[in-house]
Interface confidence: medium
């Protein structure tokens, strides 16, 4: 099956205030530790329970962080990116890219949010049509009596 996975990409500016235990998330990525093939970007890999990011609620695991306090995260070594976060101060502004998976393709394609891979309307439309045909046949049958 050649179902295509499309992504709805949105960007958001998230302002976090460093909490008692910091910003409260983990990252992967960097030029020396590519998380996504052909992409050395920095991605959120874990949101820590009760941390600043978790309490804010906007940052999600899988988000790509584009910049910290206006500083671009492109082409950085992993540890350099880590250090940038650690030295970012009390108020931290993150430019973040969210990727929402959208299903687009034939019936056999399995989307992340739909375990059966079949959109609900693909089931409802035939059921509705069958119901209408059965009702019409029943009415015709009654008229003949």
């Amino acid at each position: 099956m050649n179902g295509r996975v499309d992504y709805l990409v949105t960007e958001e500016e998230i302002n976090l205030t460093r909490g008692p235990s910091g910003l409260g998330f983990n990252i992967v990525g960097g030029t020396d530790q590519q998380y996504v093939s052909n992409d050395s970007g920095i991605y959120v890999s874990r949101i820590k329970e009760n941390g600043a990011a978790a309490l804010d609620g906007r940052l999600q695991e899988g988000d790509k962080i584009l910049s910290v306090n206006g500083q671009d995260l492109k082409n950085l070594l992993h540890q350099d990116a880590v250090d940038l976060f650690r030295n970012a101060g009390y108020a931290v502004s993150l430019r973040v890219q969210h990727r929402l998976q959208v299903q687009n393709g034939p019936i056999g394609h399995r989307g992340e949010g739909d375990p059966s891979g079949i959109p609900i309307f693909m089931v409802l439309v035939p059921v509705f049509a069958l119901t209408m045909v059965a009702a019409w046949a029943f009415m015709r049958y009654r008229q003949q009596l």
């Epitope: 235990s21 910003l23 998330f25 983990n26 820590k48 992993h78 880590v82 976060f85």
Partner: nanobody, 128 residues
Amino acid sequence: HVQLVESGGGLVQAGASLTLSCAASGRSFSTYHMGWFRQAPGKEREFVATISWTGGSTYYADSVKGRFTISRDNAKNTVYLQMNSLKPEDTAVYYCAARGGGTSVDSDYDVEEFEYDYWGQGTQVTVS
């Protein structure tokens, strides 16, 4: 998923040395931060030492600082705890733990149990 198996525990006399090993099986061991914890009889499990995924950062509980050394060999998927100048109060079951999910932007030093995703069954160390 990561499976952790500790070995190297035993009964030793005070002042002796012991090296614990923790062999990991499963995917990408080299990206996991590793830690050692211990639980003495009748006490809560406590943090002993941790090492970052690169091996570049280590951190120790005050009670073992200068006596214990944590290290790792990513080629062998193994983390070690070298314990010198052992004391009777070091008697405990020692647990190896692994934490996935990249690097914390806050600290390399994960000292809380809840930070860790995978745990071994433990190995007994008794110092007489």
